[in-house]
């Protein structure tokens, strides 16, 4: 399911509940994705010892994964709502190719991997409605993404396991940073 339970307008389980605001919906959506990532990480960690690897070792697998930095305006110091929102949306769009890579990488959590991917697409739509400056958001080039995907899928098994772990870890961190920032908006 791309949205958390109870988010659908047809949900009649709690007819007297106030409809969620845009911010509440975004917050709930991120936490829903984070729960999905948590489940995927459990499978990855049970399958290999990648989770014990330090960030320094992982960094050698030079993936260009989106990461928050001071200049992005999402931290407490130098917080800038508009700059930060652009960074969050841009980062999520950049993560999409990596989430595509994660499909078929899981045995018992295949549906969970699909749910994380679809939920992220919904989250991007929610955030784009919130953003005023959509022109500042750069969309990744589909051709570049296609060749990156081919390259990642051609790696040996060990590197694929490492890549999977690193994507999940980085995506989790990016969403946590985003959630902290969005709660200030």
């Amino acid at each position: 399911a791309p949205v958390p339970p109870g988010e659908d307008s047809k949900d009649v389980a709690a007819p007297h509940r106030q409809p969620l605001t845009s911010s509440e919906r975004i917050d709930k959506q991120i936490r829903y994705i984070l729960d999905g990532i948590s489940a995927l990480r459990k499978e990855t960690c049970n399958k290999s010892n990648m989770c014990e690897s330090s960030k320094e070792a992982l960094a050698e697998n030079n993936l260009n994964l989106p990461k928050m930095a001071e200049k992005d305006g999402c931290f407490q110091s130098g917080f800038n709502e508009e700059t930060c929102l652009v960074k969050i949306i841009t980062g999520l769009l950049e993560f999409e190719v990596y989430l595509e890579y994660l499909q078929n990488r899981f045995e018992s959590s295949e549906e969970q991997a699909r749910a994380v991917q679809m939920s992220t697409k919904v989250l991007i739509q929610f955030l784009q409605k919130k953003a005023k400056n959509l022109d500042a958001i750069t969309t990744p080039d589909p051709t570049t993404n296609a060749s990156l995907l081919t390259k990642l899928q051609a790696q040996n098994q060990w590197l694929q396991d490492m890549t999977t772990h690193l994507i999940l870890r980085s995506f989790k961190e990016f969403l946590q940073s985003s959630l902290r920032a969005l709660r200030q908006m």
């Epitope: 936490r31 984070l34 960030k55 407490q76 917080f79 902290r180």
Partner: antibody, heavy 118, light 110 residues
Framework: SVEESGGRLVTPGTPLTLTCTVS????????MSWVRQAPGKGLEWIGY??????TWYANWAKGRFTISKTSSTTVDLKMTSLTTEDTATYFC???????????????WGPGTLVTVSS | NIVMTQTPSPVSGAVGGTVTINCQAS??????LSWYQQKPGQPPRLLIY???TLTSGVSSRFKGSGAGTQFTLTISGVECADAATYYC????????????FGGGTKVVVV
């Protein structure tokens, strides 16, 4: 394990740096927090340093307290313009990551006492 | 600015009885609330997180409930060892906050 060090008796206005040393923990994977407790009082949160390297502080701590990861096993708390009100036991605590978003503190050090007195 | 308010303090409970501690957030914090136990001369110890999930190794006599702004810690079958100060902590927002902890509730066992 988590252990704090650097607490001592200082005079008002003196800067002081406390160090939190962890063992068996990869600091790059965990959020860390500093919390203090004045004698006979409750817990008072100072700030967090998250895995994304961002630092978030309590309103009263901004500008006077600085948290930084100084190595893969140490986190510092730099304090300036200390007053007698800063007399407290300072705790360092590790955040948990088995759930995806949650700032619960599941491992605490024994604390280090800072006394500010003239 | 989220403020955490704990009541009552102190609270007394008889051995074998039940003690209830309340924690109120000034605005919704979803289920991002933890409970800690602290005994004199010791650091706090995490009991419950996500409002109701018991930390590994903690007795099932401790039960957390609530969501949004109202939370409760219930200790059933109170033992002498439960005499301590209990703190709630919000994990929802770390900006524009004076303290993520509640003021604490001292439990006296009689």
């Amino acid at each position: 394990s988590v252990e704090e060090s650097g607490g001592r008796l200082v005079t008002p206005g003196t800067p002081l740096t406390l160090t939190c040393t962890v063992s068996g923990i990869d600091l790059s994977s965990y959020d860390m927090s500093w919390v203090r407790q004045a004698p006979g009082k409750g817990l008072e949160w100072i700030g967090y340093i998250y895995t994304d390297s961002s630092t978030w502080y309590a309103n009263w701590a901004k500008g006077r307290f600085t948290i930084s990861k100084t190595s893969s096993t140490t986190v510092d708390l730099k304090m300036t313009s200390l007053t007698t009100e800063d007399t407290a036991t300072y705790f360092c605590a590790k955040g948990s990551t088995d759930y995806a978003f949650d700032t619960r503190l599941d491992l605490w050090g024994p604390g280090t006492l800072v006394t500010v007195s003239s | 600015n989220i403020v955490m308010t704990q009541t009552p303090s102190p609270v007394s409970g008889a051995v074998g009885g039940t003690v209830t501690i309340n924690c109120q957030a000034s605005q919704s914090i979803s289920n991002e609330l933890s409970w800690y136990q602290q005994k004199p001369g010791q650091p706090p110890r995490l009991l419950i997180y996500r409002a109701s999930t018991l930390t590994s190794g903690v007795s099932s006599r401790f039960k957390g409930s609530g969501a949004g702004t109202q939370f409760t810690l219930t200790i059933s079958g109170v033992e002498c060892a439960d005499a301590a100060t209990y703190y709630c902590q919000q994990g929802y927002n770390s900006n524009d906050v004076d303290n993520v902890f509640g003021g604490g509730t001292k439990v006296v066992v009689v």
